[in-house]
């Protein structure tokens, strides 16, 4: 409980806080766990402990391991530890997860992003933001004090955020970066009773004997994304898998299409060289999803050949 | 009566991974798909993956994508989501559901959860 991971780049400054927290005027001593050696408080060192920070500037490789924090107070001493890992600078541009701080999630509403750990920092603007490596451009995207506003969210805003900014530790400057994922989430989705746009209630459907015929189920279901949604086809009141027909098979369409903003899914039956006895059958096209289920029921019908009259 | 048992919870570190599996136990109507919800603490319950149960369409949330996987054994009337690369903030009771039928009423049925802990 009063263990924090801390992570950083080599080379970057890093500042840990004490997970034991205290008054401003307590005495907070911390130690190298491995070695019970303690960190100085000299600022000529390039680690050192300021109250209940301990610092890294900047940062190396053969800094990662556990610290002890002990907060002493007249009364009592509480003891933490920071569990502090420091990764060598990736050469390419993706960000490996452990490398990443919490996944935030933004609306067409509500778009900020906070720059991770920035409060421990004594840094000035401007901030630099970075999409998948990218530097931000554009109107949409404003970097404000500690965190970016993106105007107008879009699904395509998605991605990994990178903060990048400049520790100032008397008067000798060092850099920070720091990632995190933005999922966007539609805050107008919704979800309603399926409604089925073909085929129509009771249709009748011309095929050809000895042909192939297709018969599309689709329907809609809501705005954004629905779960736990469904479309099939069923014979005679039986799901197609256990009919036993191997002529007559279902497939699926894509993933949700979505058609004037809602999400829609379709099945398609292909019935293989149509025999008669398929004209028999009722066909039904099952729309359902928690609001309940739709059914629109189909016939086939033999299309009659045309007359060649001289 | 139908029953749903999640099962394969359990704590893991940042970064490990875990499978969940879903039973679907009794007379089963017709299953037509199946998906995965969670819930943290104090948080609202949130959709994680969904399947047909053709198995042909799959839905993942965006905070998932990539790193989760959503399965189905139809012989086995068992779903499976196999979690990689798992963060701290997957941490949550996972929930299992099953979205069936017969004749024209729909079933909703719900389990009890599986608790997954992504700490350190």
């Known amino acids: 409980k009063f263990s924090k991971q801390s992570w950083g780049l080599e080379n970057e400054a890093l500042i840990v806080r004490c997970p034991r927290q205290g008054k401003p005027s307590y005495t907070v001593d911390w130690y190298y766990s491995q070695t019970n050696k303690s960190i100085p408080t000299q600022e000529r060192n390039r680690v050192f402990a300021s109250g209940q920070l301990l610092k890294f500037l900047p940062a190396a490789v053969a800094d990662s391991g556990i610290y002890t924090c002990i907060v002493r107070s007249p009364t009592f001493n509480r003891t933490g530890y920071a569990n502090v890992t420091i990764y060598k600078k990736q050469s390419d541009c993706n960000v490996p997860d452990y490398l990443m701080y919490s996944t935030v999630s933004g609306s067409e509403k509500n778009s900020k992003i906070y720059c991770p750990t920035i409060d421990l920092y004594n840094w000035t603007a401007p901030l630099e933001w970075f999409k998948n490596c990218q530097a931000l451009q554009g109107s949409r995207y404003r970097a404000h004090k500690s965190f970016l506003v993106i105007d107008n969210v879009m699904t395509e805003d998605a991605g990994d955020y990178t903060c990048k900014f400049i520790h100032n530790e008397n008067g000798a400057n060092y850099s920070v970066t720091a990632t995190r994922s933005f999922t966007v989430k539609d805050e107008q989705g919704f979800s309603l009773f399926p409604v089925i746009g073909a085929p129509a209630q009771n249709e009748i459907k011309e095929v050809e004997i000895g042909k192939n015929a297709n018969l599309t189920c689709s329907a809609c279901f809501g705005k954004g994304t629905q779960f736990l949604a469904a479309v099939l086809w069923q014979l005679n009141g039986t799901k197609i898998t256990d009919f036993g027909e191997p002529r007559i098979q279902q497939e699926e369409g894509q993933n949700q299409s979505f058609s004037n903003g809602l999400a829609c899914l379709d099945m398609v039956l292909r019935i293989a060289d149509v025999k008669e006895e398929d004209l028999l059958l009722q066909y039904d096209c099952l729309a359902l999803n928690l609001h309940g289920l739709r059914r629109h029921t189909v016939r086939l019908s033999r299309k009659n050949p045309i007359d060649h009259h001289s | 009566e139908v029953q749903l048992v999640e099962s394969g919870g359990g704590l893991v570190q940042p970064g490990g991974s875990l499978r969940l599996s879903c039973a679907a136990s009794?007379?089963?109507?017709?299953?037509?798909?199946m998906g995965w919800f969670r819930q943290a603490p104090g948080k609202e319950r949130e959709e994680v993956a969904a399947?047909?149960?053709?198995?042909?369409?799959?839905y993942y949330a965006d905070s998932v994508k990539g790193r989760f996987t959503i399965s189905a054994d139809n012989s086995k009337n068992t779903a499976y989501l196999q979690m990689n690369s798992l963060k701290p903030e997957d941490t949550a009771v996972y929930y299992c559901?099953?979205?069936?039928?017969?004749?024209?009423?729909?079933?909703?049925?719900w389990g009890q959860g599986t608790l997954v802990t992504v700490s350190s």
């Open positions: 559901a099953r979205l069936a039928f017969q004749g024209n009423t729909v079933f909703d049925l």
């Open positions: 399947i047909s149960w053709s198995g042909g369409r799959t």
């Open positions: 009794g007379r089963t109507h017709s299953t037509a798909s």
